[in-house]
Interface confidence: low
Amino acid sequence: GPNICTTRGVSSCQQCLAVSPMCAWCSDEALPLGSPRCDLKENLLKDNCAPESIEFPVSEARVLEDRPLSDKGSGDSSQVTQVSPQRIALRLRPDDSKNFSIQVRQVEDYPVDIYYLMDLSYSMKDDLWSIQNLGTKLATQMRKLTSNLRIGFGAFVDKPVSPYMYISPPEALENPCYDMKTTCLPMFGYKHVLTLTDQVTRFNEEVKKQSVSRNRDAPEGGFDAIMQATVCDEKIGWRNDASHLLVFTTDAKTHIALDGRLAGIVQPNDGQCHVGSDNHYSASTTMDYPSLGLMTEKLSQKNINLIFAVTENVVNLYQNYSELIPGTTVGVLSMDSSNVLQLIVDAYGKIRSKVELEVRDLPEELSLSFNATCLNNEVIPGLKSCMGLKIGDTVSFSIEAKVRGCPQEKEKSFTIKPVGFKDSLIVQVTFDCDCACQAQAEPNSHRCNNGNGTFECGVCRCGPGWLGSQCE
Amino acid sequence: LNLDPVQLTFYAGPNGSQFGFSLDFHKDSHGRVAIVVGAPRTLGPSQEETGGVFLCPWRAEGGQCPSLLFDLRDETRNVGSQTLQTFKARQGLGASVVSWSDVIVACAPWQHWNVLEKTEEAEKTPVGSCFLAQPESGRRAEYSPCRGNTLSRIYVENDFSWDKRYCEAGFSSVVTQAGELVLGAPGGYYFLGLLAQAPVADIFSSYRPGILLWHVSSQSLSFDSSNPEYFDGYWGYSVAVGEFDGDLNTTEYVVGAPTWSWTLGAVEILDSYYQRLHRLRGEQMASYFGHSVAVTDVNGDGRHDLLVGAPLYMESRADRKLAEVGRVYLFLQPRGPHALGAPSLLLTGTQLYGRFGSAIAPLGDLDRDGYNDIAVAAPYGGPSGRGQVLVFLGQSEGLRSRPSQVLDSPFPTGSAFGFSLRGAVDIDDNGYPDLIVGAYGANQVAVYRAQPVVKASVQLLVQDS
């Protein structure tokens, strides 16, 4: 009887495949007159269409690369695998969908990089004193979680330009604390102090050398520093095969994109590295602060987990920001930073207790839906994250990819990866919109009223000015 | 297409001057229309970046523009035991410009000021200043409402209350129909922000060159606040005027405070005594709600409506990913004394980092359908992020949600095409309002001329065979 395939009035194989994933096309010349060429596959076979003349592509998922998940992160870190499979190929016909799955493991003893980014405005004077021995303490604590730790240090105040900076009397440029009858450092935007190192005592030494500065207004320029610490990977020394923690400590509000106009700065932040040989951020006075969106993009690109370690007075502010910057955690810093050690350890635990998938470069015509199998083999529909994990746990996700219509570009790829991981699954998609019989098309065919059309897939495709089943 | 995207007129300014940062139409007393363009990084007489203002006579083929002459030299004056100083290097003259009647107001929000007395000082800070010019008569005046002679020590003793030293007056500017200059000063009162208002006529009559510190008796300034929601709120980042209380004899002020309440952002509508009539809150932190404000009647009910831009708004896309695209909020003014409620329409940008909503300009009735239309800029949107201006037509329900026209930047990437916009004035005298678009990164301004709308009616005549 009639069905969706036969009632749409299609006149070509391509049109037929686009009606529904259930439709098939018969290109057999011997198909009895009056039998529809576009129909359910079983109906075409009943109508004696030769099986080899039936066009009925089937969507499929093929695994192309599948290294097994690693147990440990120590050893040759470039061989550590936390996501499986690593590459699959999807073939989808119009409006069809296909399922595939991905497994993620939080491997044990994975290398960790911690970069400590500190507000050195005047009110952080006591905090600087508190963290002088943080390096060795951090190493002791983190040794329980990783045998491969590196730590580094950087500092920020704000853009050294009026009105953020004191510019008079002349002495204030060299000593912004001049009118307070005390001494502090000239103001700076961001300076990189210590490249990530496993010599943890170097951290203590460098911190002891630091001194606070002073700026005029309440918000600081920490977002400039976050951006530079994120994108200057060589300068900072972020390793490819390590967890990246960027610890941001402050007791104040922060400047955001478009604030720079108050200093006459309107050039949008370009998200590039501008830390020169002097280890200072060279574009501090020429480029605006980065936006939350740009920071999110760069943190995600570089697989960096941002930790806002902030004092009680601004914790709500940074909590709100963290909801707009996925993968960010917030901890309450004591007024003198004395609890920062526990804060980092807790934040790292929080980061490792969660796996959340993110998708990059998803073609517009594709939509994905997720089902998560987290703990106890329980399937949770619509979820693409798992919480409450212990290091070493493995979770899996079932993903359905559905295509809308028939995209113009026939091949595309996208990536699925856990937030903060370097490992990912690359999905190569082929959109199967064409029929194999099109390759045997016969232009100017005698079958089409002596050359008035192309004979293709068992029917005539008429040239300009000609109509009819034989272009008559 | 109402705005001709092909036959453009271009005006260019000096390289690196940021010509096009601000702009306005200027009608002189003889009805001639020109374009005033701000170029805040123009080099001054001593090769310092003082900024500058250019007056571009309308000419279909465009070209160069003569600059308006202002005193760009630093000034010093001794008054009793005090020394008053102005500093005009990097003052940003032309960061905002506005024209009213035959007067041009051009502001330098980063003009610095200091007062020295023995070993003490007020501190060298960006109080900001606005220069006024009547090009035909050659008259000049200056208005700097945040200059004062209080020394730093006094501010410390008073816990920095009423501290106008970082005002940046003229960061935004507008003139009411009655000729009152209203300046936004987002750094006023220690970065809360303030508004200053004074009649243009009184600014001219009270001005004496070289005095440096004088009083405009009819001026009024908004008030300081101890409410933490206002701290670092940059109240005055943008400003507009309109009619929002039903009394046609008064004008209300619309003020953008994009970092109000810990960067949530807000826009407030005030009466001329700075009493708040309405407050509209931002929707998303750090979206910069209030970066731009515009007032026009879009739905043809005779009441002014309000548009607010939040160029850093992030939209939740597929996979719950946030994409920074920018958003414009339309608030229709209801009948009677009711508060402006929820936005009637949200226009959301489509391009990542395009900053849709950076500037909004009323266009007048572009398509002659009885409803006023608007233009919205996305200075980093469009192909290759070169910038884009989108036209939205008015209708009885408010605005149409799809643009009627999209103007892609004729300039290269990084030009910030659309950073400044002005419309609703007929520059070429064809009876249709035109649009001027600044692209400070290219140091250029483009003029888009509106063309007559062709209304086609089709009649089908069927003849008996």
Epitope: - | G31, Q64, P66, L68, L69, D429
Partner: antibody
Framework: QVQLVQSGAEVKKPGASVKVSCKAS????????MHWVRQAPGQGLEWIGA????????SYIQKFKGRVTMTRDTSTSTVYMELSSLRSEDTAVYYC???????????WGQGTLVTVSS | EIVLTQSPDFQSVTPKEKVTITCRAS??????LHWFQQKPDQSPKLLIK???QSMSGVPSRFSGSGSGTDFTLTINSLEAEDAATYYC?????????FGQGTKLEIK
């Protein structure tokens, strides 16, 4: 291209009036100011005033106020300058000049010699 | 009103020589100054607008400079056809005024 064609030479007695015409072509007549400048024999150029044909707005310098009248006829794209109560020192060549879109006197008429003599 | 003072009033020069005519304004006029050439029994002709912008069709030997109150018209390598009177004019503010003129004679 832009052309400004002035009326012919005139000889007038003191106290009389003279009306000089300037016919414009090659541009939109109503969009640009037309100025008048005079030059006494062997002397420099002296600006008299201007008219905006779009709305008949005029502007004269103090010296000529009350004696000079500028008018326009848009149907013929012609501007007129009438000077009354003529004196011998008004003997001069009178030029019309177009104040173009760049605010400069780029186009000039050929000049009209007005001689005031008893 | 703004007074423009030209110097010299008269100059007699041999061909191929470089000529400099100056124009001083009684107050600052930015770059709103223009130079005209007038030959006997002819209308004035605009040479330079806004202090330094040459009009199209004007020989490249003519150039202008200056800003504020002091302006210069320079003719490099004078030619016989350059014999004329040269006027400066300001359009900074009404009334628009001209300099008294500089007459250039070819020896």
């Amino acid at each position: 291209q832009v052309q400004l064609v002035q009326s012919g030479a005139e000889v007038k007695k003191p106290g009389a009036s003279v009306k000089v015409s300037c016919k414009a072509s090659g541009y939109t007549f109503t969009n640009y100011w037309m100025h008048w400048v005079r030059q006494a024999p062997g002397q420099g150029l002296e600006w008299i005033g201007a008219i905006y044909p779009g709305n008949s707005d005029t502007s004269y310098i103090q010296k000529f106020k009350g004696r000079v009248t500028m008018t326009r006829d848009t149907s013929t794209s012609t501007v007129y300058m009438e000077l009354s109560s003529l004196r011998s020192e008004d003997t001069a060549v009178y030029y019309c000049t177009l104040y173009d879109g760049y605010y400069v006197f780029a186009y000039w008429g050929q000049g009209t010699l007005v001689t005031v003599s008893s | 009103e703004i007074v423009l003072t030209q110097s010299p009033d008269f100059q007699s020069v041999t061909p191929k020589e470089k000529v400099t005519i100056t124009c001083r304004a009684s107050r600052d006029i930015s770059n709103n100054l223009h130079w005209f050439q007038q030959k006997p029994d002819q209308s004035p002709k605009l040479l330079i607008k806004y202090a330094s912008q040459s009009m199209s069709g004007v020989p490249s030997r003519f150039s202008g400079s200056g800003s504020g109150t002091d302006f210069t018209l320079t003719i490099n390598s004078l030619e016989a056809e350059d014999a004329a009177t040269y006027y400066c004019q300001q359009t900074n503010s009404w009334p628009y005024t001209f300099g008294q003129g500089t007459k250039l004679e070819i020896k």
